[in-house]
């Protein structure tokens, strides 16, 4: 048993069938010595009585809040959650796994850039007594520090007969230099609880590995005399590292045509410009990614050809 | 992903075009050696991320943009002596600065250098055959070393006696190689800021 | 005492359909993972399909995806297997079994597909 | 498909020592918790093994397990006459987890 925060313990459970559970011993926080009795949730039958209070915990009944009286008046509570441990492995059921980019990833993160902030999400299908919290730092042995935010709920999706829930939290890396050269990772840490199960999820991973910049802005055609070419070209997403002559970038221009099935035609530049082919009912794309770390390509951004 | 193969203009920054040809080197070195080591823990997750020229060189602060001078969090800079005079600096106005930056990058190019042809000598003797250096690599770190011209003292290959312990050498190369790749895409973007300024 | 009865075995022919039933006593079983495993005459055991405790997700092995489906009813404490499309390679006797540290396992049910 | 790999057989007379291996790699046994079961012929797999070297109650002391890197190994010291049976490791992927993988089987057989 720990102590996630003040009053409230996980007790972690080896969890099978017919499990012996975890013993427990309950201690009011009150100078009285004498007359205290037990109680578990909204239940006014008496548990035991005395300052402290043993219990075989097995399964969820045998959470809850536990609270210690005094002729009628409440002396403390203890809220104990269950921490689920299946065939040595911690449990998750309150989390969907992605499975991007591999099995078993429950939380994805990116970063727009190279300044120490980043954004981690993750879903769920519950919609209720649901609370996350989020704790980061780069490395584990030593950390340094990464400050989080709350987590919010972002989005939410109907998939199928579910509704899926997403949850987000930014992250600020406390003193981050763009051009350093990571060695140790970022960790991300994340505390759910749904009623009275508790669950952790951790990813680890370099800034550089996460990095997915903005689309490029500005895109615009610029038509060429007397042909079917036009000059497409579009600058740096404004959220994106400086300078960008040491940040660069790479591009790629697409042309599609308004069918999926049609060829695309797609070039690849390092300059913020590109000459292609306009076809009829076409539309020119333009994604970027690292010039020089292949880490994600951005999102595309488009202008139709007519 | 390969990076496009860049055809340097007359005028343009010398070694622009070497850094580039090493990074898409040592990139394609790295992605042979995590197929081939594939039962080796190789990949960035399961390797410890060691930097050997860590307290020797200062590539990352002496090669600051200008415009990150000012990040308090870039400028834990260590003391650091080198030689400064080199042909990549093609300009009088070359300040001590990037004179300094190009000789930390020199000196990165030889200490890796020196500890990939150790690492070499000992996996030509692996009885397996499973991998070796590309030797495209080695010639595009010297290639770049001569486009930089420093004269420094030669660092002695490594000569070891006791029998090599492949498994660790072949872990230590993929430590090696993931630590290369970091430090060429610096390396390249330095070229690149250079050539821009 | 955890208990875990199976039925519904039997000979079936190739490409039709059967239904294994799992019934379980003795703990609460809604709040328990559960597996089937099967084992072919002579042969080594071989992992089927696993579902949540709360049904909410189910894991198949390659070998029967899309022609065997895992499902539970956690008001009739059973678990079942679904199978459709049999082959001869279906053969086996089939366990059903708690997912956890210590495990408890069904007597088995053989089927048999042949024509 | 079996990823773990032990011996098809083994033997030993009563009284000896008899190990079974089972190999596997970094995303199974390097990364999960090794289990054995004891298969006596017509029967339901019995645990004798969890959590790589624990003994659940019942299971007699001469049953006992390691693991060491990707491989797990179960010894049974001063072998008897009613140990003669198939024996299977079992383990997880980290990526497929919680699909059971299991051992390809190792028949035990007392000589004497």
């Known amino acids: 048993i720990w102590e996630l925060k003040k009053d409230v313990y996980v007790v972690e459970l080896d969890w099978y069938p017919d499990a012996p559970g975890e013993m427990v011993v309950l201690t009011c926080d009150t100078p009285e010595e004498d007359g205290i009795t037990w109680t578990l949730d909204q239940s006014s039958e008496v548990l035991g009585s005395g300052k402290t209070l043993t219990i075989q915990v097995k399964e969820f009944g045998d959470a809850g809040q536990y609270t210690c009286h005094k002729g009628g008046e409440v002396l403390s509570h203890s809220l104990l959650l269950l921490h689920k441990k299946e065939d040595g492995i911690w449990s998750t059921d309150i989390l969907k796994d992605q499975k991007e980019p591999k099995n078993k990833t429950f939380l994805r993160c990116e970063a727009k850039n190279y300044s120490g902030r980043f954004t981690c999400w993750w879903l769920t299908t519950i919609s209720t007594d649901l609370t996350f919290s989020v704790k980061s730092s780069r490395g584990s042995s030593d950390p340094q520090g990464v400050t989080c935010g709350a987590a919010t709920l972002s989005a939410e999706r109907v998939r199928g007969d579910n509704k899926e829930y997403e949850y987000s939290v930014e992250c600020q890396e406390d003193s981050a230099c763009p051009a350093a050269e990571e060695s140790l990772p970022i960790e991300v840490m994340v505390d759910a609880v749904h009623k009275l199960k508790y669950e952790n999820y951790t990813s680890s991973f370099f800034i550089r590995d996460i990095i997915k910049p903005d689309p490029p802005k500005n895109l615009q055609l610029k038509p060429l005399k007397n042909s079917r070419q036009v000059e497409v070209s579009w600058e740096y997403p404004d959220t994106w590292s400086t300078p960008h002559s040491y940040f660069s970038l790479t591009f790629c221009v697409q042309v599609q045509g308004k069918s999926k099935r049609e060829k695309k035609d797609r070039v690849f530049t390092d300059k913020t410009s590109a000459t292609v082919i306009c076809r009829k009912n076409a539309s020119i794309s333009v994604r970027a990614q690292d010039r020089y770390y292949s880490s994600s390509w951005s999102e595309w951004a488009s202008v139709p050809c007519s | 992903r390969n990076l496009p193969v860049a055809t340097p203009d007359p005028g343009m920054f010398p070694c622009l075009h070497h850094s580039q040809n090493l990074l898409r080197a040592v990139s394609n070195m790295l992605q042979k050696a995590r197929q081939t080591l594939e039962f080796y823990p190789c990949t960035s997750e399961e390797i410890d991320h060691e930097d050997i020229t860590k307290d020797k060189t200062s590539t990352v602060e002496a090669c600051l943009p200008l415009e990150l001078t000012k990040n308090e969090s870039c400028l834990n800079s260590r003391e650091t002596s080198f030689i400064t005079n080199g042909s990549c600096l093609a300009s009088r106005k070359t300040s001590f600065m990037m004179a300094l930056c190009l000789s930390s990058i020199y000196e990165d190019l030889k200490m890796y250098q020196v500890e990939f042809k150790t690492m070499n000598a000992k996996l030509l003797m692996d009885p397996k055959r499973q991998i070796f250096l590309d030797q495209n690599m080695l010639a595009v770190i010297d290639e770049l070393m001569q486009a930089l011209n420093f004269n420094s003292e030669t660092v002695p290959q490594k000569s070891s006696l006791e029998e090599p312990d492949f498994y660790k050498t072949k872990i230590k190369l993929c430590i090696l190689l993931h630590a290369f790749r970091i430090r060429a895409v610096t390396i390249d973007r330095v070229m690149s800021y250079l050539n821009a300024s | 005492q955890v208990q875990l009865v199976q039925s519904g075995g039997g000979v079936v022919q190739p490409g039709r359909s059967l239904r294994l039933s799992c019934a379980a006593s003795g703990f609460t079983f809604s709040s328990y993972g559960m597996h089937w495993v099967r084992q072919a005459p002579g042969k080594g055991l071989e992992w089927v399909a696993f579902?949540?405790?709360?049904?909410?997700?189910?894991y198949y092995a390659d070998s029967v995806k899309g022609r065997f489906t895992i499902s539970r009813d956690n008001s009739k404490n059973t678990l079942y297997l679904q199978m459709k499309s049999l082959r001869a390679e279906d053969t086996a006797v089939y366990y059903c079994?708690?997912?956890?540290?210590?495990?408890?396992w069904g007597q088995g049910t053989m089927v048999t597909v042949s024509s | 498909s079996y990823v773990l790999t032990q011996p098809p057989s083994v033997s030993g007379t009563p009284g000896q020592r008899v190990t079974i291996s089972c190999s596997g790699g970094?995303?199974?046994?390097?990364?999960?918790?090794v289990k054995w079961y004891q298969q006596l012929p017509g029967t339901a797999p019995k645990l004798l093994i969890y959590?790589?070297?624990q003994r659940p109650s019942g299971v007699p002391d001469r049953f006992s397990g390691s693991k060491s890197g990707t491989s797990a190994s179960l010894a049974i010291t001063g072998v008897q006459a009613e140990d003669e049976a198939d024996y299977y490791c079992q383990s997880y992927d980290r990526g497929t987890h919680p699909a059971l993988l299991f051992g390809t089987g190792t028949k035990v057989t007392v000589l004497g």
């Open positions: 959590m790589n070297d």
């Open positions: 579902i949540r405790y709360d049904g909410s997700n189910k």
């Open positions: 079994k708690t997912h956890g540290s210590h495990d408890n």
């Open positions: 970094r995303s199974n046994i390097g990364s999960n918790t």
